[in-house]
Interface confidence: medium
Amino acid sequence: IPAPSIRLVPPYPSSQEDPIHIACMAPGNFPGANFTLYRGGQVVQLLQAPTDQRGVTFNLSGGSSKAPGGPFHCQYGVLGELNQSQLSDLSEPVNVSFPVPTW
């Protein structure tokens, strides 16, 4: 099954203390999938999409950007034929960066 798309959604964080919002969308006809957000190889958050939606938005509280390091990826799982679990590949990476202070 194809990899999901991933993107940062507004409002974008301006510092490490700001929350981060990341949308993850399954392509095609995979509503109600279970989505996983990863960072640094480990799971950050799990969300299930509503049965009529193909994606979710992960809302990470302020400070989530500090550890573990590395870009975010997401992935989704669905029940396929004969009730067998299937997993997508990882999304492309998305990096969270912060504006350089002007002072």
Epitope: I1, Q42, V43, Q86, E92
Partner: antibody, heavy 117, light 115 residues
């Protein structure tokens, strides 16, 4: 330091069952997917399946689906592999491996399973 | 035809470079896959080396020297593990792996000999 220690291997007759365990330490077990991989003597590795962090989502290789059951107990930091209807071709070293995203980075030392009458 | 094909063996001299290939079956486009590489020495489990999809989507294993690197050859539909400055301790079996059809698939492995 991440450590994975498999146990439960041995010699078993064809058609019988066996349960392997993998004790994990040195990382937050519940935050990582876990895998079982086997390697027959003189052959390359063969992936058997993945169980996600909360245990609700398990994906198996086609070659073993229906005969193998992967489970985990996050309170005990332990991964399990239940193998039923064992065949001669199941003879291999069985490794558990720690998830890295949905792949795997660290492997245990393995436990040998020999299926023989 | 196997999903991933690796040459059974390869020999190279100390200090030289070795290029290990992992060819994807026809109809499977290497450009869309992350290729993972593992090293295995006799009597030990495989060790994770690196993952490579593109220069913007790659990851080196913890403690893996930078002389191990990944790339792709789109014309050959292959992933490549490049080992530069070969050392005697690099003598091992090397396996590639991809996530394909909701399963991890390994190549048959390449036995690298450092002469």
């Amino acid at each position: 330091e991440v450590q994975l220690v498999e146990s439960g291997g041995g010699v078993v007759q064809p058609g019988r069952s066996l349960r392997l365990s993998c004790a994990a330490s040195g990382f937050t077990f519940s935050s990582f997917a876990m895998h079982w991989v086997r390697q027959a003597p003189g052959k390359g590795p063969e992936w058997l399946g993945i169980i996600l962090y909360e245990g609700g989502h398990v994906v198996y290789a086609d070659s073993v689906r229906g005969r193998l059951t992967i489970s985990r107990d996050n309170s005990k930091n332990t991964l399990y592999l239940q193998m039923d209807s064992l065949r001669d071709e199941d003879t291999a070293v069985y490794y558990c491996a720690k998830g890295f995203y949905h792949a795997f980075d660290v492997w245990g030392q393995g436990t040998m399973v020999t299926v023989s009458s | 035809q196997a999903v991933l094909t690796q040459p059974a063996s390869l020999s190279a001299s100390p200090g030289a470079s070795a290029s290990l290939t992992c060819t994807l079956r026809s109809g499977i486009n290497v450009g869309t896959y992350r290729i993972y590489w593992y090293q295995q020495k006799p009597g030990s489990p495989p060790q994770y080396l690196l993952r490579y999809k593109s220069d913007s989507d790659k990851q080196q294993g913890s403690g893996v020297p930078s002389r191990f690197s990944g790339s792709k050859d789109a014309s050959a539909n292959a992933g490549i593990l490049l080992i530069s400055g070969l050392q005697s301790e690099d003598e091992a079996d090397y396996y590639c792996m991809i996530w394909h059809s909701s399963a991890w698939v390994f190549g048959g492995g390449t036995q690298l000999t450092v002469l």
